[in-house]
């Protein structure tokens, strides 16, 4: 009785269960009752990452420097090349097909998380007591200056974009 289903790592072809090709190899010829499945290794620039019956290997991804990409991990016969972005850039998608410059956090916002090759800068508003007066992809919100520790008094209140302005104490009041 011909099989209607096959075991794991097998496939059904012409009423026969044949072994799938292992990762890193492509199918050359289906099995017969007398012969095992014929598989061939993928060439140097190709890969297959699953047990398969593909007759062609997939081409390794090309990390195009013109798009700001560079190789993070070289592909093997079983894995694709992993691209990442050059310094100052990050991927536009999970598959990392192109790169864009990291976002800068505007004045009033500080860097919560510095960008990586695969993720953009995360900014956060400076809370009360902190400020940022620059547009930056690295700078966090800085705390207002503590006038008291310098034996000074606040002459101008700080904002999320400006530091407090300290000045000398009024001696006449003393």
């Amino acid at each position: 009785e011909p099989p209607t289903a096959c075991r794991e790592k097998q496939y059904l072809i012409n009423s026969q269960c044949c072994s799938l090709c292992q990762p890193g190899q492509k199918l050359v010829s289906d099995c017969t009752e007398f012969t095992e499945t014929e598989c061939l290794p993928c060439s140097e620039s190709e890969f297959l990452d699953t047990w398969n019956r593909e007759t062609r290997c997939h081409q390794h991804k090309y990390c195009d420097p013109n798009l700001g990409l560079q190789v993070q991990q070289k592909g093997t016969s079983e894995t694709d090349t992993i691209c990442t972005c050059e310094e100052g850039l990050h991927c536009t998608s999970e598959s990392c097909e192109s790169c864009v410059p990291h976002r800068s956090c505007l004045p009033g916002f500080g860097v919560k998380q510095i960008a990586t090759g695969v993720s953009d800068t995360i900014c956060e508003p400076c809370p009360v007591g902190f400020f940022s007066n620059v547009s930056s992809a690295f700078e966090k919100c800085r705390p207002w200056t503590s006038c008291e520790t310098k034996d000074l008094v606040v002459q101008q209140a700080g904002t999320n974009k400006t530091d407090v302005v300290c000045g000398p104490q009024d001696r006449q009041r003393a």
Epitope: N14, S29, F34, T35
Partner: antibody, heavy 117, light 109 residues
């Protein structure tokens, strides 16, 4: 390169025995089923026997059943055909051929067996 | 057992002409597992076509196969001098036995 080379042919008297060999090279012999096919002088091709890659399954043409035995030694990359009780009608060129789902894709050059008194 | 009948027995043609060879099976060939082989005098057969219509590695595209079920055809679009030989069809699905047709000889006219 992928190659099959038969040997062991010759002239033999009716009723006697002969063993043919087929040496394989250039491919993973132990993964392939193998066939013997023969061709009588001036005639067409006649399939003789097949053996599975691990040697467990064997089939024979009715004309040789009970007289011929196909076997293999995967450690030596060699296929055999033991021919007993030979008859004049067994006179032929004997070819070994590789089994695939594409048919018999590689053939040896053949070895001549002549059964004559 | 499937019987394969090839026709014509002999085909006399000139180089450059088209050759059409027929192979008829006594019952349907499973999965179109039908092959065509070429054999020149003193040489072993060579696989030309498998699966009724797929060319084997290194076979020129002037050779083509067609058909399914019980009727199969090998066509040589323009005969080259090296194509004059005997051609066999073979069913390699319905065994045992594996069967060959009686052959068609393509000779120079």
């Amino acid at each position: 390169q992928v190659q099959l080379v038969e040997s062991g042919g010759g002239v033999v008297q009716p009723g006697r025995s002969l063993r043919l060999s087929c040496a394989a090279s250039g491919f993973t012999f132990e993964k392939y089923g193998m066939h013997w096919v023969r061709q009588a002088p001036g005639k067409g091709l006649e399939w003789v026997a097949v053996i599975s890659y691990e040697g467990e399954k064997k089939y024979y043409a009715d004309s040789v059943k009970g007289r011929f035995t196909i076997s293999r030694d995967n450690s030596k990359n060699t296929l055999y055909l033991q021919m007993n009780s030979l008859r004049a009608e067994d006179t032929a060129v004997y070819y070994c051929a590789r089994d695939t789902s594409r048919g018999h894709d590689i053939w040896g050059q053949g070895t001549m067996v002549t059964v004559s008194s | 057992e499937i019987v394969l009948t090839q026709s014509p027995g002999t085909l006399s043609l000139s180089p450059g002409e088209r050759a059409t060879l027929s192979c008829r099976a006594s019952q349907s060939v499973s999965y179109s597992y039908l092959a065509w082989y070429q054999q020149k005098p003193g040489q072993a057969p060579r696989l030309l076509i498998y699966g009724a219509s797929s060319r084997a590695n290194g076979i020129p595209d002037r050779f083509s196969g067609s058909g399914s079920g019980t009727d199969f055809t090998l066509t040589i679009s323009r005969l080259e001098p090296e194509d004059f030989a005997v051609y066999y069809c073979s069913d390699y699905a319905d065994y045992p036995p594996f069967t060959f047709g009686g052959g068609t000889k393509v000779e120079i006219k």
